[in-house]
């Protein structure tokens, strides 16, 4: 009987010879549970597992804790891969996180963190980041040290307010902090002076809602 080959991430898919962009089935570490993810096999050497994408506002990102845990959306379009899978994956080995951003004026930028992982659900999927480089700001737009993840039904921010309810979307809110890539999608010419848009403050400044975002991870030793 032929053994079923399973892949933990898109880097393993790439190294197995699958070098075409697309949706691949990945397997949770130390488990048979599967998840579908989009793999970017072209950008920066390939092997990137896409954990978030915004591009057209077709998917509602104001979701529950459980939905952010297991993932939602369509891997070929707008989606969130799932906090549980990303947490398990990034605690197996060292991963880098690249965040690619597009504004409405045709500009692109990125932030690259040389070490990224999420704590377990018991610790509210707190984000841990080290070593920022890139063109989307010299200061991290994800507050440091990292915060717990918050959703509309899971308020773990550092604010007496409820950041997720006001800003919409699940995110690692501070009080409320300089970013939220899961905010409301605003079309061009309606994307300025918005407090609840798709924000990356240290690139675009105050109240600017972005056109497109992608969050992707890859093993540091790829």
């Amino acid at each position: 009987k032929e053994e079923q080959i399973s892949f933990r991430d898109c880097a393993e898919v790439f190294k197995s010879g699958h070098t075409t962009n697309g949706i691949y089935t990945l397997t949770f570490p130390n488990s048979t549970e599967e998840i579908k993810a989009y793999c970017d096999m072209e950008a920066g050497g390939g092997g990137w597992t896409i954990i978030q994408r915004r591009e057209d506002g077709s998917v509602d990102f104001q979701r529950t804790w459980k939905e952010y845990k297991v993932g939602f959306g369509n891997p070929s379009g707008e989606y969130w891969l799932g906090n549980e899978f990303v947490s398990q994956l990034t605690n197996q080995q060292r991963y880098v996180l690249k965040i690619h951003l597009k504004d409405w004026e045709g500009n692109e930028a990125y932030s690259l963190y040389e070490h990224f992982y999420l704590s377990s659900e018991e610790l509210n999927y707190r984000i841990h980041l080290k070593g920022l480089t890139g063109t989307a700001g010299k200061i991290s737009s994800i507050s440091q040290p990292g915060n717990d993840f918050s959703t509309k039904d899971g308020d773990n921010d550092k604010c007496i307010c409820k950041c997720s309810q006001m800003l919409t979307g699940g995110w690692w809110f501070d009080a409320c902090g300089p970013s939220n890539l899961n905010g409301m999608y605003y079309p061009q010419r309606q994307n300025t002076n918005k407090f609840n848009g798709i924000k990356w403050y240290y690139w675009k400044g105050s109240g600017y809602s972005l056109k497109a975002t992608t969050m992707m991870i890859r093993p540091a030793d790829f």
């Epitope: 604010c159 409820k162 009080a175 300089p178 918005k194 407090f195 924000k199 403050y201």
Partner: nanobody, 123 residues
Framework: EVQLVESGGGLVQVGDSLRLSCAAS?????????VGWFRQAPGKEREFAAG???????AYADSVRGRFTISRDNAKNTVYLQMNSLKTEDTAVYYC????????????????WGQGTLVTVSS
């Protein structure tokens, strides 16, 4: 162009009350994530005093909690700061500011600012 205009400052005695007003033109306050009152005493840094979120929730600095109250009148597009039991250390220029981003207590995240109104508390 957005203009925030503060009023209501003046010279008062210790223990007195004042109500500051911040009126906005060119934008409604509901478009901001947070409208904050900051104050700057002579020779000191500008510091957060009180703020009100779009949701209506409020926040206060420890130094003013229980004495100051922030409120909003959407119909008049005005935010107020009611200041009771004033102390000499409350003497400062008080600024109204509007923010779309960031942490509410950090002045650098506020985009629109008024010119300020002076409050002097004498003994």
């Amino acid at each position: 162009e957005v203009q925030l205009v503060e009023s209501g400052g003046g010279l008062v005695q210790v223990g007195d009350s004042l109500r500051l007003s911040c009126a906005a033109s060119g934008r409604t306050f509901s478009t901001y994530l947070m409208v904050g009152w900051f104050r700057q005493a002579p020779g000191k840094e500008r510091e957060f005093a009180a703020g009100i979120w779009s949701s209506g929730d409020t926040a206060y600095a420890d130094s003013v909690r229980g004495r100051f109250t922030i409120s909003r009148d959407n119909a008049k597009n005005t935010v107020y700061l009611q200041m009771n039991s004033l102390k000499t250390e409350d003497t400062a220029v008080y600024y109204c500011a509007g923010s779309y981003d960031g942490n509410y207590y950090i002045p650098g995240f506020y985009k629109d600012w008024g010119q300020g109104t002076l409050v002097t508390v004498s003994s």
